[in-house]
Interface confidence: low
Amino acid sequence: GSQHIRAEKAMVDGSWLDLAKRSKLEAQPFAHLTINATDIPSGSHKVSLSSWYHDRGWAKISNMTFSNGKLIVNQDGFYYLYANICFRHHETSGDLATEYLQLMVYVTKTSIKIPSSHTLMKGGSTKYWSGNSEFHFYSINVGGFFKLRSGEEISIEVSNPSLLDPDQDATYFGAFKVRDID
Amino acid sequence: GSQHIRAEKAMVDGSWLDLAKRSKLEAQPFAHLTINATDIPSGSHKVSLSSWYHDRGWAKISNMTFSNGKLIVNQDGFYYLYANICFRHHETSGDLATEYLQLMVYVTKTSIKIPSSHTLMKGGSTKYWSGNSEFHFYSINVGGFFKLRSGEEISIEVSNPSLLDPDQDATYFGAFKVRDID
Amino acid sequence: GSQHIRAEKAMVDGSWLDLAKRSKLEAQPFAHLTINATDIPSGSHKVSLSSWYHDRGWAKISNMTFSNGKLIVNQDGFYYLYANICFRHHETSGDLATEYLQLMVYVTKTSIKIPSSHTLMKGGSTKYWSGNSEFHFYSINVGGFFKLRSGEEISIEVSNPSLLDPDQDATYFGAFKVRDID
């Protein structure tokens, strides 16, 4: 009898471990979205970037949703959010409208349940990109730990979108869930 | 009989918790590697940095391997990768070869099974470090979430390696596993 | 008998899962602290920033302590630490004391058991903020993975504190526990 119970216990515990492992995987949303260079807005004004890849190269998504340029949270939790934005200009692209630039990124959260939009993180720099140099480059990185609720949307706004570096290793943003909300 | 079963269950569950805790720890690779200043290449060209500490000061590694300047993945998973690279120059070090600099970092992944090397993340800035100032400094930070397979190698390339800040708090890179691959 | 044991096992396993889930939540400390703009030191020298919010807007803390400008570790573990620091100046604020600036952040760890203070991470840039531009901005981001012991304190030092951007999305630092120490 005792042996039978041990065997049954091991079997049931094994299935619990499988179940726990499976549910743990399902319960850990993440996304890494890379810029879609075919649809970068022009101009120097601040815009929301709506074209990102979610399923090619380094880009991937799981248990989150990407729609209309927004990363939508499907599961409440605490997430680490990050963004890397690269700007560049080569003299062969023509003259800059101004040599004094404000190169900025804003990571925003929109709540559709309680209509509101807020900036979670910002970064950037004012730059003087003079005509004395043929090539200019600048990158921004931001990251932070935030409580996100199901249905909330994360989006990226930048200034001077026409200067964005279109490489997947240059301009991207992402999130991964670290823990549940108590 | 029932009491005996309860006692045995508590004991076995206890050992399962120990085992689960131990396996969880073993299953979470990480590394934080700091620059080895005794062997920084000279020059201004782009080079792969091969000398890093893994076991002194803030540097540490667990369930990953460091070999020939590469951080080797031992366990499939999704990892958060990061790098912080600082460049500096003081006039006492002599004149710069050029005042127009491209200070860059590239975090690359090499797959030895299918020989290929790809840039996962890049960052940096073009800088004008004029002789009007006695000291110049600039830091780059990049980070992102990537799927890594056992045997893949992470390495760091920089431009202008001779300008690297050799402090362990300045120039480092690292990784930690966040979750398994489904 | 066997049916009774199965029922009891399911019940006990259920409570184990609850307990495991609860203890997992309790075992994951985190903090995201945002600058308290009412008490930013003046001047251009390097100072320790002691005023941070921990319970309003994006700021939050759990299983860590904030006291006297320090983030205190309550639980041994490996943590990912990060900081985002923004500096800005508008000509309406008056002239800068100097146009050549060193804008820096230092993330330091103090151990009160063995009195010592060490810089874990640093970042920043020298900047030339000329009077030709009415507005200047610059952000720094640093992040890294560190072993922290209960009682150790994390603090933030910056140069030129009077230039700090007081927005919660601009100037903040934080930490979250990734794993236990073996």
Partner: antibody, heavy 114, light 108 residues
Framework: SVEESGGRLVTPGTPLTLTCTVS????????MSWVRQAPGKGLEWIGY??????PYYANWAKGRFTISKSSSTTVDLKITSPTTEDTAAYFC???????????WGPGTLVTVSL | DMTQTPASVEVAVGGTVTIKCQAS??????LAWYQQKPGQSPKLLIY???ILASGVPSRFKGSGSGTQFTLTISGVQCDDAATYYC????????????FGGGTEVVVK
Amino acid sequence: SVEESGGRLVTPGTPLTLTCTVSGFSLSNDVMSWVRQAPGKGLEWIGYIWSGGSPYYANWAKGRFTISKSSSTTVDLKITSPTTEDTAAYFCARGFGSSGLNIWGPGTLVTVSL
Amino acid sequence: DMTQTPASVEVAVGGTVTIKCQASQSIGSNLAWYQQKPGQSPKLLIYSASILASGVPSRFKGSGSGTQFTLTISGVQCDDAATYYCQQGYSVGNIDNAFGGGTEVVVK
């Protein structure tokens, strides 16, 4: 691309399910909205759904419509108890947020009549 | 909810037409504009209040934020004859319709 199907003539009170089939993008990563347009009238947003999330409905649509994801490439709109006022062309479109509804289907016509 | 004016407007070829859309509460820049021709499905023109969708001619311009938005078509062409709709993409909570009532543009 997006294509709607299932539109037909039904009598009042007979439940009807419309299907939206997508190709070229993944439903697991996109919001899908349903919009309708009565003959000679303007566009009316019914609601949307995203993978893993609950559907959202306009106030007037709550209880009258059910949006669900029926497979990895299809989203359904069920008209629970049609009335003559539900006669309209029904469109399925990708998206909702600040970037708008950027891919539309050609629509499917539903006629509710005795 | 969205209030769109005017309901109909006549414009000569080469002229300029302005369509206004008012939100009942602030929606930031979360507004899109669509063009619909008879028998066709709507086509996205502008999103995020002012960003031109891919392939849309530059004579279409969106502006505004908060509660007041404008679509301006300058140098109107015969092909621009259609009904135009605004749509808020800000809130799905407690709304009757995300779309404005529409504006019919008749080109003479």
